[in-house]
Interface confidence: low
């Protein structure tokens, strides 16, 4: 007879990340004997909860209820209902509620209220939902990366990761952007640190990391976007806005009062002798990464080196993982391999730039006219953040590897908040154990 | 104690250029951006530009850009202030002053005693 | 660029009176406002930071408030060493723009 697999003890968890434009629901999976085996949790499902992040629910709670549902349903159905209670669910919400509670932590703790009470309607294990500091995501997002790459294994790995395997054991460093904020994490060279504000230690698997890490908020690509259109908006001579990130040909009406919502536009926030401004594109991408430039204020720096706004950056260290809007932006784009250069990025963004409305409509037709509209200004931020403001080089560029998933797992800050959570991650190398995923007999 | 040392007086004929020097002695100078103001004879201060020695990277108002050139030099804890195209406006004494600001706040908390240049044909 | 307007352009008080000086932003600076005294053949000398801060060394009776557009520096009582020129100077954004000054002179 042939040999069977007998079922195993598989364990899941659940992790839903509340982010500023969107909430995704992830369902994680692992061999309930190798819970401390490093490389074993996998991603089983992602769900992607329709509707906007949960701050835009502030004044209409009561839909949060029915916004999760879908998601939570699908959870129901993909985790067996034997393990339905031992199954954790975390919530953790980041700069978008981050910004949220700084206009008000009242609203921004009603809306984590009515998702509490909406969340503990289900039968897992409802572990909380907070506000994750952009520290946390930072961590959680360079620990994520590292641990789907095998870099905390001191054994040889049994998956092969093409093209980041390679031998050593130097981790990544993770750069992660959201709509609303942007995390740059790594390992620096140097060991002491100048600001201990960015500095973190972790004994992890029985070797000792010290992190530089730093979260930009309102630097995600939504806000930066705001930013700019507030700060051009400015010294626009009348409700015309002719902005260069925009395709020629495009047009949108904007009303102030949505520009001036965000904490994010507070310093360049004016009284505009009009309610509305009209967006004309001119697509022009030297003038839009000019434009760009001006949200960064390298002006001062009180430390050794800063990578904007005062904030310290040691020197680059090693390889970097690019991930979320960083990935999809740079995917959509066609702009993800490894063999395409700093400049040859530059050059396609000038092309796709000024490329007119009409046709970029006509030739990428099922894409979401408000997304398809931004991806000039998104791909010219993300080119100006690495370069201007992390400081990446033509050289260095080649160390950045955008990454969508590891081994079937997004890359991002849910799979690392949940192996902290669920204690999964040793701080010594625990014991050797088997390699194979199923018991045969 | 920090201090900034800057060049001696200078008398320019219109046309030429001037190189201003400013040396922080006594402390830090490549974390802390430089900035560069001047002052006409009774009038008030007007800011030109400034550097943040560690990037090498310079910053100009609009007034000046193209005739002005900043730069710094880490070894010798130097900032310099270059003007080209002379003209007799450009009598006025030239400071250079540290920022001494950090994430939230930014001001010029240490400054030079001023090199006065003269524009005279 | 952003406009800094101080009024009055000169102001003459008694020794050991107040004195109330007045910056105008064109648009919001935040806090990111600084005050200079200057004295003649002198250097401008740092008094109030972020507003409001009194920078290190300077006597109590200086005090910044205000923020946005509107900004004051208040002297509480002169001394004779405070007749001067002060500036009010905004680094939000660049241009660093100064305002034009006022002049505190013995009445």
């Known amino acids: 007879t042939q040999n069977k697999a007998l079922p195993e003890n598989i364990k899941y968890g659940i992790v839903l990340d509340a982010g500023s434009s969107h909430t995704s629901l992830y369902i994680y999976k692992w061999p309930a004997e190798k819970e401390n085996d490093t490389g074993v949790v996998h991603q089983v499902e992602e769900c992607r909860v329709k509707g906007p992040g949960i701050s835009k629910y502030v004044q209409k709670v009561n839909e949060i209820g029915i916004y999760l549902t879908d998601c939570m349903e699908r959870a129901r159905e993909v985790i067996p209902r034997s393990q339905h209670q031992e199954t954790p669910v975390y919530l953790g919400a980041t700069a978008g509620m981050r910004l949220l509670r700084m206009e008000s932590e009242e609203l921004a703790d009603r809306v984590l209220d009515v998702v509490e009470r909406s969340l503990s309607n289900y039968p897992f294990d409802f572990q909380g939902a907070r506000i994750i500091t952009g520290q946390e995501e930072g961590a959680y997002g360079w620990i994520t990366i590292n641990y789907l790459l095998g870099k905390f294994s001191q054994k040889t790995r049994w998956f092969s990761i093409v093209p980041y395997e390679t031998n050593n054991q130097e981790t990544f460093g993770a750069l992660d952007l959201g709509g609303a904020s942007t995390q740059i994490t790594f390992v620096p060279q140097n060991q002491t640190t100048e600001s201990p504000d960015n500095a973190l230690q972790f004994r992890l698997y029985g070797k000792d990391y010290n992190v530089y890490t730093h979260s930009f908020l309102c630097y995600g690509k939504d806000q930066a976007l705001w930013q700019k259109l507030a700060k051009d908006i400015q010294v626009a001579s009348n409700e015309i806005l002719r902005d260069p990130c925009f395709h020629p040909g495009y047009k949108k009406v904007v009303n102030v009062s949505d520009l001036y919502k965000t904490p994010c536009t507070k310093r360049f926030e004016m009284t505009l002798p009009f309610q509305q401004f009209e967006i004309q594109g001119i697509g022009n991408y030297q003038q839009c990464h000019q434009s760009v430039l001006e949200l960064f204020n390298t002006s001062y720096c009180p430390y050794s080196q800063c990578a904007f706004n005062g904030i310290f950056l040691p020197p680059l260290q090693g390889d970097f993982g690019a991930f979320s809007a960083f990935y999809f932006v740079m995917n959509f784009l066609n702009l993800t391999s490894e063999k395409v250069s700093q400049e040859k990025v530059t050059e396609m963004m000038k092309k796709f730039c000024s490329q007119p409305w009409e046709e970029i409509k006509t030739s990428y037709a099922g894409v979401k006219e408000k997304y398809l509209s931004e991806y000039c200004f998104s791909g010219t931020y993300i080119l100006s953040l690495l370069l201007q403001g992390y400081h990446f080089t033509a050289d260095s560029w080649e160390h950045i590897h955008f990454i969508g998933k590891i081994q079937g797992s997004d890359a991002g800050w849910t799979l690392g908040y949940m192996l902290n959570l669920t204690n999964m991650i040793p701080a010594e190398q625990p014991l050797s154990t088997p390699l194979s995923h199923s018991t045969y007999v | 104690q920090v201090q900034l040392v800057q060049s001696g007086a200078e008398v320019k004929k219109p046309g030429s250029s001037v190189k201003v020097s400013c040396k922080a002695s006594?402390?830090?100078?490549?974390?802390?951006?430089i900035g560069w103001v001047r002052q006409a004879p009774g009038q008030g201060l007007e800011w030109m530009g400034g550097?943040?020695?560690?990037?090498?990277?310079?910053n100009y108002a609009q007034k000046f850009q193209g005739r002005v050139t900043i730069t710094a030099d880490e070894s010798t804890s130097t900032a310099y202030m270059e003007l080209s195209s002379l003209r007799s406006e450009d009598t006025a004494v030239y400071y250079c002053?540290?920022?001494?600001?950090?994430?939230?706040?930014?001001?010029?908390?240490?400054w030079g005693r001023g090199t006065l240049v003269t524009v005279s044909s | 660029e952003i406009v800094m307007t101080q009024s009055p352009a000169t102001l003459s008080v008694s020794p050991g009176e107040r004195a109330t000086l007045s910056c105008r932003a064109s648009q919001s600076v935040g806090s990111n406002l600084a005050w200079y005294q200057q004295k003649p053949g002198q250097a401008p000398r740092l008094l109030i930071y972020?507003?409001?801060t009194r920078a290190t060394g300077i006597p109590a009776r200086f005090s910044g408030s205000g923020s946005g557009t509107e900004f004051t520096l208040t002297i509480s009582s002169l001394q004779s060493e405070d007749f001067a020129v002060y500036y009010c100077q905004q680094l939000t954004k660049w241009p660093l723009t100064f305002g034009g000054g006022t002049k505190v002179e013995i009445k």
């Open positions: 006594g402390g830090a100078f490549s974390s802390y951006a």
């Open positions: 550097i943040i020695p560690t990037f090498g990277t310079a």
């Open positions: 002053a540290r920022d001494g600001g950090g994430y939230q706040h930014h001001y010029f908390d240490l």
């Open positions: 972020g507003a409001s």
